[in-house]
C-alpha cells in the first residue's frame, strides 16, 4: 500500500521571499528504493488553470523546471519527498501537487500554498493647513499581501485599566497596489489635542494575515500638546 | 519588564488597620495610576480606588469612604493602601493593579488580609 | 453604579465544546468592556479588551462581541487549561465595576 501525506488543514503560508519547503511524506509498506522510484512535483497558478511540472525525480535523473527547486534524494530514502522553493514569489502561491510512482502503485497529495508579505508601518504627525490645537497623525502600512488589512486606532488614558478603540474622526485611504504586487494603505486620526488629558498613549494596531500579533506604533500626549515619541516602534502602552 | 510585588499576608482583629504595600518596577514610576481590588474568599473583584503616582490625586469607591487611604513613596516606588476600622466581611485578598499594555494590565500577586477576633 | 449581571453563575462542559458567557451593563458602557481569566489563587489575567479586541498571547480561540448594554465572551473550542473562572468589566466609569463571574466546570 501506496499513501501520500500533505501539510494537515492543506494549506501552507509562507513569507515571501523565504525559501519555503512544501511537505510531501510517502508511506509504503516496504523499504524504499529510490532507483526504482519517480516523483513529480506540479503546481496550478490562482490565475490560470492549467498546471505545470516544477520538479521530477525519476532513478538517476532529476530536473528542476523552476529554478532552485530541490528534493533531497538523502531524505527521499526515509520517505520525504517534501520539495524545496528558495526565494518564493507572490505569483507563485497557488496549489502543489506531489505525486508518487513506486511501480505498479501510485499515489499523490495536494497542498495550497499561500505567500504573504507583512507590513512595515509608521506614524506620521501633518500638522499642515490643521487648525491650531488639532493634529492629524497618519499611519501608513507599507510592502503587505494579501490586500486584507485592518487598521484600527485605540486610546489609554492613564487612569482606567484598557485600551478603548477610537472610532470617530478616523479615515483609512484605499488600499494602493505597487508594482511588486504588495499593497500599501494610509489611517489618518484627527486629535483635537486640548480636549484630551496629557499621558493619554494613542495607538495605531495593524491587524494582517502575514502578523502573528499585531503591528503597533503609538505616541504620549504630554501637556506640550503630543509627542511622537522615539518609542513609537516599542509595541508598547507602559 | 513591570513588576507588582506585594507585602505579605496580615491577620488583624476587628476594628484595627491593615497597611498593605505595593513596589512598583521595570517602568518610570510616577507616569501611571494605581488601582487597588479586593477579593473576599469564593467571591467576585471589588473596586477599592486608585491613586495617580506623582501623589497628586485619588479616587475612592464610595463603599470605603472614610476608611481607606492610599498614598504613595516616589523614593521607594511603592504605593499603600491602608483599611481601617476592620471587619469580618474585610477579609480578602487585595491586589494593586496598572493599566496594562498590549499583553493586559498588571497585577500584583495579591495580599490576604485576615479580620478575625 | 453601573452594574454588570454576568450569566450563567456556572456552566458545565466538555473539552472541545463552544461555550459563550454573557454580561449585560445596568447602562450603555459603549465598547468599555473587558473579560477577565481566573485560576484558583492567582490575580486575574486580562483577555479581551475594547468588547471585542483579543490582548496578544491570548489564544485565537477566545472571542469577544457587543456593546452598549450586551456583551459575550466565546470560548470555541474548550481547552483543559480553559476550565475555571471568567470576569466581565466595566471601564468607562468609575468605580470599575465587574460582573459577578461564571465558573466553567468539566461535565
Known amino acids: 500500500d501506496l499513501k501520500v501525506e500533505m501539510m494537515a488543514g492543506g494549506t501552507q503560508i509562507t513569507p515571501l521571499n523565504d525559501n519555503v519547503t512544501i511537505f510531501c511524506n510517502i508511506f509504503y509498506s516496504q523499504p524504499l528504493n529510490i532507483t526504482s522510484m519517480g516523483i513529480t512535483w506540479f503546481w496550478k497558478s490562482l490565475t490560470f488553470d492549467k498546471e505545470v511540472k516544477v520538479f521530477e525525480f525519476f532513478g538517476d535523473h532529476q530536473e528542476a523546471f523552476r529554478p532552485g527547486a530541490i528534493v533531497s534524494p538523502w531524505r527521499l530514502k526515509s520517505g520525504d519527498a517534501s520539495l524545496r522553493l528558495p526565494g518564493i514569489q507572490l505569483e507563485e502561491a497557488g496549489e502543489y501537487r506531489c505525486e508518487v510512482v513506486v511501480t505498479p502503485l501510485k499515489a499523490q497529495g495536494t497542498v495550497q500554498l499561500e505567500v504573504v508579505a507583512s507590513p512595515a508601518s509608521r506614524l506620521l504627525l501633518d500638522q499642515v493647513g490643521m487648525k491650531e490645537n488639532e493634529d492629524k497623525y497618519m499611519c501608513e502600512s507599507s510592502g503587505f499581501y494579501p490586500e486584507a488589512i485592518n487598521i484600527t486606532w485605540e486610546k489609554q488614558t492613564q487612569k482606567f485599566p484598557h485600551p478603548i478603540e477610537i472610532s470617530e474622526d478616523v479615515i483609512t485611504g484605499p488600499t494602493i497596489k505597487n508594482m511588486d504586487g504588495t499593497f500599501n494603505v494610509t489611517s489618518c486620526l484627527k486629535l483635537n489635542s486640548s480636549q484630551e488629558d496629557p499621558g493619554t498613549v494613542y495607538q495605531c494596531v495593524v491587524r494582517h494575515a502575514s502578523l502573528h500579533t499585531p503591528l503597533r506604533s503609538n505616541f504620549t500626549l504630554t501637556a506640550a500638546r503630543h509627542s511622537l515619541s522615539e518609542t513609537e516602534k516599542t509595541d508598547n502602552f507602559s | 519588564q513591570v513588576q507588582l510585588v506585594q507585602s505579605g499576608a496580615e491577620v488583624k482583629k476587628p476594628g484595627a488597620s491593615v497597611k498593605v504595600s505595593c513596589k512598583a518596577s521595570?517602568?518610570?514610576?510616577?507616569?501611571?495610576?494605581m488601582n487597588w481590588m479586593r477579593q473576599a474568599p469564593g467571591q467576585g473583584l471589588e473596586w477599592m480606588g486608585g491613586?495617580?503616582?506623582?501623589?497628586?490625586?485619588?479616587d475612592y469607591n464610595e463603599k470605603f469612604k472614610g476608611r481607606v487611604t492610599m498614598t504613595v513613596d516616589t523614593s521607594t516606588s511603592t504605593v499603600y493602601m491602608e483599611l481601617s476600622s476592620l471587619r469580618s466581611e474585610d477579609t480578602a485578598v487585595y491586589y494593586c493593579?496598572?493599566?496594562?499594555?498590549?499583553?493586559?494590565?498588571?497585577w500584583g500577586q495579591g495580599t490576604l488580609v485576615t479580620v478575625s477576633s | 453604579d453601573i452594574q454588570m449581571t454576568q450569566s450563567p453563575s456556572s456552566l458545565s462542559a466538555s473539552v472541545g465544546d463552544r461555550v459563550t458567557i454573557t454580561c449585560k451593563a445596568s447602562?450603555?458602557?459603549?465598547?468599555?468592556v473587558a473579560w477577565y481569566q481566573q485560576k484558583p489563587g492567582k490575580a486575574p489575567k486580562s483577555l479581551i479588551y475594547s468588547a471585542s479586541n483579543r490582548y496578544d498571547a491570548v489564544p485565537s480561540r477566545f472571542s469577544g462581541s457587543g456593546s452598549g448594554t450586551d456583551f459575550t465572551l466565546t470560548i470555541s473550542s474548550l481547552q483543559p487549561e480553559d476550565f475555571t473562572t471568567y470576569y466581565c468589566?466595566?471601564?468607562?466609569?468609575?468605580?470599575?465595576?465587574f460582573g459577578a463571574g461564571t465558573k466553567l466546570e468539566i461535565k
Open positions: 493593579t496598572r493599566r496594562g499594555d498590549y499583553f493586559g494590565d498588571f
Open positions: 491613586i495617580y503616582l506623582s501623589g497628586d490625586s485619588t
Open positions: 521595570g517602568y518610570t514610576f510616577t507616569n501611571y495610576w
Open positions: 468589566q466595566q471601564y468607562i466609569s468609575y468605580p470599575l465595576t
Open positions: 447602562q450603555n458602557v459603549g465598547k468599555y
